[in-house]
Structure formats: C-alpha cells, structure tokens
C-alpha cells in the first residue's frame, strides 16, 4: 500500500534497513558508521551548493526473533516484515537502503508498490536484474557473466590464441552470498553464459573437482570457482595438476593481491584470479580501518548509497523538482556520481560498473601480475601484459579442450 514519505519541506529522510540476515556477516554498528559518515559528506555537499536542507537516516532494525540464521537463507520474509514495520509507523523515507540479500530484495520488489528508489549493497542474483527502481552498488552476477563470455571468446591476444567454449564450474553449496549467486548465474541453463558455451558441467563434490585435475578424459581444461586462495588450497592442496588446466578463481571483493609484500603461493600457479581494481583512500577511513577487504567493500557500498542519494537530491532540488515522484524513483541509473573513493558509474539498469582485473602468478617473481583489465561499462577487455611469464606452455593459455589428455 502507499506509505507517506518523510521527504519534503526541506527535510529528507533515508530509510536504512538493518537486517539480521545480510550478504556479509558485518556488525550493524559498522554499517551505521558508514551511513553516518556518508551523511556528513552529503550535508557538506548540499551546503556547499547553497541548499539549506536537512538530511537524516532512520535505521530500521528487525526484531531478530524469527529470521535469525544470520545469512541470507531466511531473509525473504525479514525484508517484508521490515517494510510492514515502516508502513505501520508511517516512517518511509525518500529512499530505501538495503536489503543486501537477493531473496529479500526480489521479494520486496515483487510485493510492494515501489514509488521510491531502493539502493542495495548486494542483491547479486540474476533475479534482481533489470528492476526499474533498484540500484545495486556491488558487482552483480550479470557483470561477471559478461566478462567470462567476453574472455572465453577472445582469441586474438598474444597469450590467448584460442576461443574457449567449455568449462567446469565448481559449486559445493558452502559459498558466501556473492559467490553463491555468481555461480548460480553460471549454472543456470537459461543464462547468457550457458547459452554461449558448448559444454558446461557443475562439479558439486570436492572429489569431483580433485579427479578432474588429472583426468585424461576431461571435457574441459577450464574450471571456474569462487572464493579466496585459502578456499582453493583446502580443496586442491598440493595435488598434481595437469599442465593445461586453467583454474579461474573469482574473488572480486578482495584486494590483498595488490599489496606490495604479497607472494603468490605455489598452488596458485595454474590459477587466474578475477578481482576488482583496488580502491585507495579507503585504507585510512575511520569506518573501514578494522574491516577485512570484503567487508570494506560492503560498508563502502552503504556509504556510496548515501552519497548517491545526496547526488540525486541535489540535482532534483536545484531543478526545483519534486522528490516523491516516480521520476525520482527511476532516476538512480545511467549516471556517474562522486563516490567516497572516486567516481562511481551506474549503467542503464542502475548496476555499478567497474574495472575487473585478471591476475596471473609470475613464474619468475612468484608475484601476482595484471594480465588484463575489463571495463564492465563498455564490455571490453584491455590486455596489460603482452608477454606474461605464465606457467603454461609457451607462455600462452592452453586450448580449453585437450586433444590427447594432459600434455
């Protein structure tokens, strides 16, 4: 039902859903700190623009009695319960920040008359694609899928002279929320990735993965998985790996690879790591100092959500336009705004664009090196290292299909 919004007469409120079930196990206090830091910046920017208005956030907490798994499995109803709470209290702001779980976002979007914008730090799944009033500030599965298809098709680089059309996907059900939806998208039979590949099999057991590494009859040399190096080591250990196996490790929200003193462990030599380009100023920020890289990205998305609202509020106020309109609700897309750590670009569907980075381990230096970058905004790959010191034969990525088993 239509809920009146606290969003006029120079006073603008942001409703922040503080859900017990979250994409990342982040203390809600840290998210509050991120939101409050964002509010300070927004107030300063509005004041500098000569706009004498009040901007506040209302944190809406779930009672946690029913929906207490802590992860996203029981988030579907928690989001709706919080919306009901907002509705009963007549406390809807101009914008809703949260939820982060794909299940809850999808359900909330489905079950509500959305005449206000929703900003999410998460909602990675394909089911949250193309939603008219939803903005996602962490890379959704669709962006990953487009990179992989682009990379698979690439065959004109000095280090990749074969198009690939096959893959194994390792997915054992213990993944983090981001990985769960990334792999889900690759597994889905109707997805772009599946449509473009000739062969794709999901490996669900550790043993299946381990057997493939030296199986002469394997149908693909390429295995996609999601997680960090430690996750790979637990699975692979020091097992022998056929020399034309390529493991693609998706680890988007982890910038440890870019630290100066990091040495790649030996088990990473057959691995290409896909991550996001690292931020810079965040390292000194008050809200992020004690956070792990993944959690820093999550908290940053909350902060950037506040800055995005401030950006849109400023534009609409300067143009003398009403905030409580469908026009405002649909405006949070196809733009670039000043985020906390640099510019943030949103595509036509309100999803964040980024630079994805594919890293390899140099056999010379045992360091991670950038092989190529990929701009999600233009769906384009840019080679960086034209003569990589790979472990693979002739310093080229092998074909995805082995002619005669491990060479």
């Amino acid at each position: 039902s239509q809920v009146s919004q606290n969003c006029h007469n120079g006073s603008y409120e942001i409703s922040v859903l503080m859900m017990g079930n979250s994409a990342f196990a982040e203390p809600l206090k840290n998210l509050e700190d991120a939101v409050n830091e964002g509010l300070e910046i927004v107030r300063g920017r509005l004041q500098n623009a000569g706009l004498n208005v009040t901007v506040n956030a209302t944190f809406m907490y779930s009672d946690g009695l029913i929906h207490n798994s802590g992860d996203c499995r029981s988030s579907t109803c928690e989001g709706l319960d919080l919306l009901r709470k907002i509705s009963n209290a007549q406390r809807m702001g101009c914008v809703l920040i949260g939820p982060s779980c794909t299940y809850s976002t999808f359900q909330m979007y489905l079950d509500t008359e959305l005449s206000y914008p929703m900003i999410s730090a998460g909602s990675f799944g394909l089911s949250c694609d193309y939603k008219e009033t939803l903005t996602r500030l962490m890379s959704p599965a669709r962006k990953l899928m487009y990179f992989l298809v682009n990379f698979w098709k690439t065959n004109d680089l000095p280090f990749k002279t074969y198009s690939w059309s096959t893959s194994y996907v390792y997915k054992n059900g213990t993944e983090t929320e981001d990985c769960f939806w990334y792999l889900n998208a690759l597994e889905a039979s109707v997805s772009y990735f599946s449509h473009e590949l000739g062969f794709k099999v999901v490996l669900r057991q550790d043993k299946e993965f381990q057997d493939i590494l030296m199986d002469h009859n394997r149908k693909s040399n390429v295995i996609i998985m999601c997680g960090g190096p430690e996750f790979l080591y637990k699975l692979k250990g020091d097992r022998a790996v056929a020399e034309d196996i390529v493991i693609i490790l998706v680890d988007l929200f982890n910038d440890q690879y870019f630290e100066d003193n990091v040495t790649a462990p030996d088990y990473m030599k057959n691995v290409l790591v896909l991550t996001l380009s690292p931020g810079n100023s965040l390292l000194n920020s008050s809200f992020s100092r004690n956070l792990s890289p993944t959690k820093r990205d999550f908290a940053l998305a909350y902060l950037n959500g506040i800055l995005l609202f401030g950006h849109m509020l400023k534009i609409f106020l300067e143009n003398g336009e009403n905030i409580t309109t469908p026009k405002f609700a649909h405006a949070f897309r196809n733009l670039t705004f000043e985020g906390y750590d640099g510019p943030v670009t949103l595509d036509d569907w309100g999803d964040v664009d980024s630079t994805m980075v594919l890293l390899y381990t140099s056999v010379d230096t045992k360091k991670y090196k950038v092989l190529l970058t990929y701009d999600t905004h233009v769906n384009k790959t840019y080679p960086v290292d034209m003569s990589p010191t790979f472990t693979w034969k002739n310093s080229k990525l092998p074909n995805d299909i082995t002619g005669r088993g491990p060479q």
Partner: nanobody, 131 residues
Framework: QVHLVESGGGSVQSGGSLRLSCAGS????????MGWFRQAPGKERERVAT????????HYADAVKGRFTISQDNAKNTLYLQMSSLNPEDTAMYYC????????????????????????WGQGTQVTVSS
C-alpha cells in the same frame, strides 16, 4: 610534489609523425606508472597508452595500436609517445599522467582513471592533424 611537463605537440598533416615528451620530477619511476591520455574538444579524456613501473608492461587504446609507441628513459626521467600514421581523429590535447603503483596495480588502468584524485597530470600539449 610531482611535476610533469609535456612538449613536442604541434600541427602535422595526415599520415605524419610526432614525438611527445614528458619530463617528470618529484617521484621515482620504480614506484610510479606513467601514461598518455588525450582529450578532444567536447569529449571525455581517454587513455592512449600506459607503461608500468618496471617499464615492461604497455597498455594501448585500440585506436592507436600499431601506430603509437610509449617508452621511457629512466636516466632522464622522461616519458615518450612516438606517434606515426597520424589522422585527424588523433587531434586532441595530450596529457602526461603519473600514479603510484599499488603492488601489481597501476591506477591508470582503471576505467575511471581520468577522474581519480590520486593521479598526477601535466598541463598538456596540443596535437592537431589536418587532412
């Protein structure tokens, strides 16, 4: 304080060549990556070519591949851009840029590089190519 000064721009006929130079001070090549960007009137600043702190990884825009070559002379603290087979689409203001490496990462490779605060820029040198 990082200071970058470009030179070598000018007017040239289509098919001609130019060599741009960028003299730098206030930083060391061993910690910074360097690059050339350009901005045509009414357009956004775009990456042309970059070179990493080791001087071995070059990164070119599609439009200039095979025609432009980036190089550096560490002894002279100078970055170069050799441009050949120039065409009118290459007309722009050319800027030299420097940024501190973060491990393997050069911020000039980021899609948002022209807008990032921690990148140092020169004043630019104009290149005009007439048909």
């Amino acid at each position: 304080q990082v200071h970058l000064v470009e030179s070598g721009g000018g007017s040239v006929q289509s098919g001609g060549s130019l060599r741009l130079s960028c003299a730098g001070s206030g930083y060391t090549y061993s910690t910074h990556c360097m690059g050339w960007f350009r901005q045509a009137p009414g357009k956004e600043r775009e990456r042309v070519a970059t070179i990493d702190k080791d001087g071995r990884t070059s990164h070119y825009a599609d439009a200039v591949k095979g025609r432009f070559t980036i190089s550096q002379d560490n002894a002279k603290n100078t970055l170069y851009l050799q441009m050949s087979s120039l065409n009118p689409e290459d007309t722009a203001m050319y800027y030299c840029a420097a940024a501190e490496h973060r491990g393997a990462w050069c911020p000039l490779w980021d899609r948002s590089a022209p807008l990032l605060a921690h990148i140092h820029w020169g004043q630019g040198t104009q290149v005009t190519v007439s048909s």
